[in-house]
């Protein structure tokens, strides 16, 4: 089966990430878009800081930490209004990812 330009093969993901520095040195803001071809009931998301297919119910409920989006050794917390999540590294540095 041939794919048109821009199409994804089944079970593949691609991600577009926009990083921007914050005025606070310990905080990194991150905006990303993932496209995945997933199994039924799943949708593009982020797991262990990689684009991945995640259960669609996570997206519906905005329980972003249930994707396990942070790297091992980090802690995950929801942003206010469930607009995204933060990953806190052991040293205290915080990575913020917003979902739009």
């Amino acid at each position: 089966q041939f794919l048109k330009e821009g199409q994804l093969a089944a079970g593949t993901c691609e991600i577009v990430t926009l990083d921007r520095d914050s005025s606070q040195p310990r905080i990194e803001e991150r905006s990303q878009t993932a496209r995945c071809a997933c199994r039924k009931g799943q949708i593009a998301g982020t797991t262990r800081a990689r684009p991945a297919c995640v259960d669609a119910r996570i997206i519906k409920t905005k329980q972003w930490c249930d994707m396990l989006p942070c790297l091992e050794g980090e802690g995950c917390d929801l942003l206010i209004n469930r607009s995204g999540w933060t990953c806190t590294q052991p040293g205290g540095r915080i990575k913020t990812t917003t979902v739009s």
Epitope: G11, C53, D66, L68, G75
Partner: antibody, heavy 122, light 108 residues
Framework: QSLEESGGRLVTPGTPLTLTCTAS????????MGWVRQAPGEGLEWIGI?????STYYASWAKGRFTISKTSTTVDLKMTSLTTEDTATYFC???????????????????WGQGTLVTVSS | ELDMTQTPPSLSASVGETVRIRCLAS??????ISWYQQKPGKPPTLLIY???NLESGVPPRFSGSGSGTDYTLTIGGVQAEDAATYYC??????????FGAGTNVEIK
């Protein structure tokens, strides 16, 4: 990184019992946690899972009698209406998600406790 | 509810032989299977996840294969220390997860 179960003991049928799994060296906010049991001389049996958010899912046979909850460092398994069939070693396990080459995510029970023995006998 | 049929229940092999353990799922689990080794009195340890991904620190003689409903754990050149019971775990954490009944591997 380690897991340690506690609370297992000899109880009489019908007695409620709560087991506790204490996690060290990692954040429960960044993993799923599951409970598995093993009757003497038998195989492994899945009980249920708790997600980072605190949402829970159970094996069909465990619904209603078993409840999983957590704090920042512990995961509890509350058991009610115990019968002799519930005699087993109860394990807690950390469930990570491994991402394959194609973005598909797979469960990995990558860290287990040593287990705690629950004996139900009259 | 998902059912995982594991065969054989037990087997005996000589050092150096290739051992194969099969798990058959009652529905397509899209490579959602992991394999565990358990020795008496100990908790299980992870060998393979995602059908074919070798867990870090596991000897390369262990391998996994399969797709759809049919999956196999292979121990190529089995060693004395591989005597244990092996379990498959099929399904996904957001749906149904089930262990196979286990395969007891004895080394002659």
């Amino acid at each position: 990184q380690s897991l340690e179960e506690s609370g297992g003991r000899l109880v009489t049928p019908g007695t409620p019992l709560t087991l506790t799994c204490t996690a060290s060296g990692f954040s429960l906010s960044n993993y799923y946690m599951g409970w598995v049991r093993q009757a003497p001389g038998e195989g492994l049996e899945w009980i249920g899972i708790i997600y980072a958010s605190g949402s829970t899912y159970y094996a069909s046979w465990a619904k209603g009698r078993f409840t999983i909850s957590k704090t920042s460092t512990t995961v509890d398994l509350k058991m009610t209406s115990l019968t002799t069939e519930d005699t087993a070693t109860y394990f807690c396990a950390r469930i990570d998600i491994g991402v394959g080459d194609y973005g598909w995510a797979y469960d990995r029970l990558d860290l287990w406790g040593q287990g705690t023995l629950v004996t139900v006998s009259s | 509810e998902l059912d995982m049929t594991q065969t054989p229940p037990s087997l005996s092999a000589s050092v150096g032989e290739t051992v194969r353990i099969r798990c058959l799922a009652s529905e397509d689990i899209y490579s959602g299977i992991s394999w565990y080794q358990q020795k008496p009195g100990k908790p299980p340890t992870l060998l393979i996840y995602g059908a074919s991904n070798l867990e870090s620190g596991v000897p390369p003689r262990f391998s996994g294969s399969g797709s759809g409903t049919d999956y196999t754990l292979t121990i190529g050149g089995v060693q004395a220390e591989d005597a244990a019971t092996y379990y498959c775990l099929g399904g996904y954490s957001y749906s149904s997860i089930t262990f196979g009944a286990g395969t007891n591997v004895e080394i002659k």
